[in-house]
Interface confidence: low
Amino acid sequence: MDGSGEQLGSGGPTSSEQIMKTGAFLLQGFIQDRAGRMAGETPELTLEQPPQDASTKKLSECLRRIGDELDSNMELQRMIADVDTDSPREVFFRVAADMFADGNFNWGRVVALFYFASKLVLKALCTKVPELIRTIMGWTLDFLRERLLVWIQDQGGWEGLLSYFGTPTWQ
């Protein structure tokens, strides 16, 4: 058997591997963008940069725009403010599960999950726990794989995000 490089290959936009890979790129970019704007230049956030193709760039810009809108979502802000960073793993998965507890999936909630992760990262930076950053990314993508992957596949992959939110006029 071969495959000593990156494991198990990848396929089209709806393959598990491609969705997770794009999700990882988008999440990292989203967190770096938001944390960078809030906390200024943070060396802890200087993770390796994935190459961005035109499609991923569009998706990143779409996420950035929605993230800005979520800043004014009071319900989400309250939920995030209540997070106890003493046991962040348990809290993360509980809040993430609560977001989808009713069994209804939509792109808004997927983005809210990313937004929640970025807020946790900011909390981690503020409380001098930079090692939590990669960990929080791992949790978010674990949750995405366990609970959201099949749904994202059913939407035709990440491209469905663009059609759901529409392409902003300034693009």
Epitope: M1, G3, S4, G5, E6, Q7, L8, S15, S16, E17, I19, M20, K21, G23, A24, F25, L27, Q28, L47, E48, P50, F93, R134, T135, M137, G138, L141, D142, R145, E146, R147, L149, V150
Partner: antibody, heavy 127, light 107 residues
Amino acid sequence: EVQLVESGGGLVQPGGSLRLSCAASGFNLSYYSMHWVRQAPGKGLEWVASISPYYGYTYYADSVKGRFTISADTSKNTAYLQMNSLRAEDTAVYYCARGGAYYFGYYGSGSYAMDYWGQGTLVTVSS
Amino acid sequence: DIQMTQSPSSLSASVGDRVTITCRASQSVSSAVAWYQQKPGKAPKLLIYSASSLYSGVPSRFSGSRSGTDFTLTISSLQPEDFATYYCQQSSYSLITFGQGTKVEIK
């Protein structure tokens, strides 16, 4: 060529300890999740523990939690399983296996799938 | 923890037969399911990952599918070298469980 070689198995008395090693070659262990899986004589496969060296995450089956410790020394490209308070029911062939590759902050969606396995090392717990 | 109930525990088949093995998850899981083949005295070999993706180097007669909480491994035309024990495996939040195994024997 990817290779995993286990060592450290043997006969031990109940309540005793053993440390298993899994020497990896052909890839950088830092960027893969690693797993230990055991198989009691004539029985099926049982997952024991996993580690993601990049994060330092460790995970354990309930049956070994508190008794076994998984670790990795990335400078030696080796994973370990420290087994304490051994019981007769821990008797098995212990395999180490490689899981998913790490990229951009994430162990890939195939991280649970074990694509390379060692030859196994037999641990016998008996008085 | 999520349990994987594998059936049948054993089956007898002839070369050329179509063979189907099923694993049922005790609760809803993602497609984080893999299938392995093991021969006596040997380490398991990965056949299928992500429920339906064929691992490199594995013959195309092996395929995997998913329907709800049921995961199926199909061997379209059994070959002499396919007589072995097959295991399914799932991961939920990095906790892994294997099915009990299915022994495929010569009829």
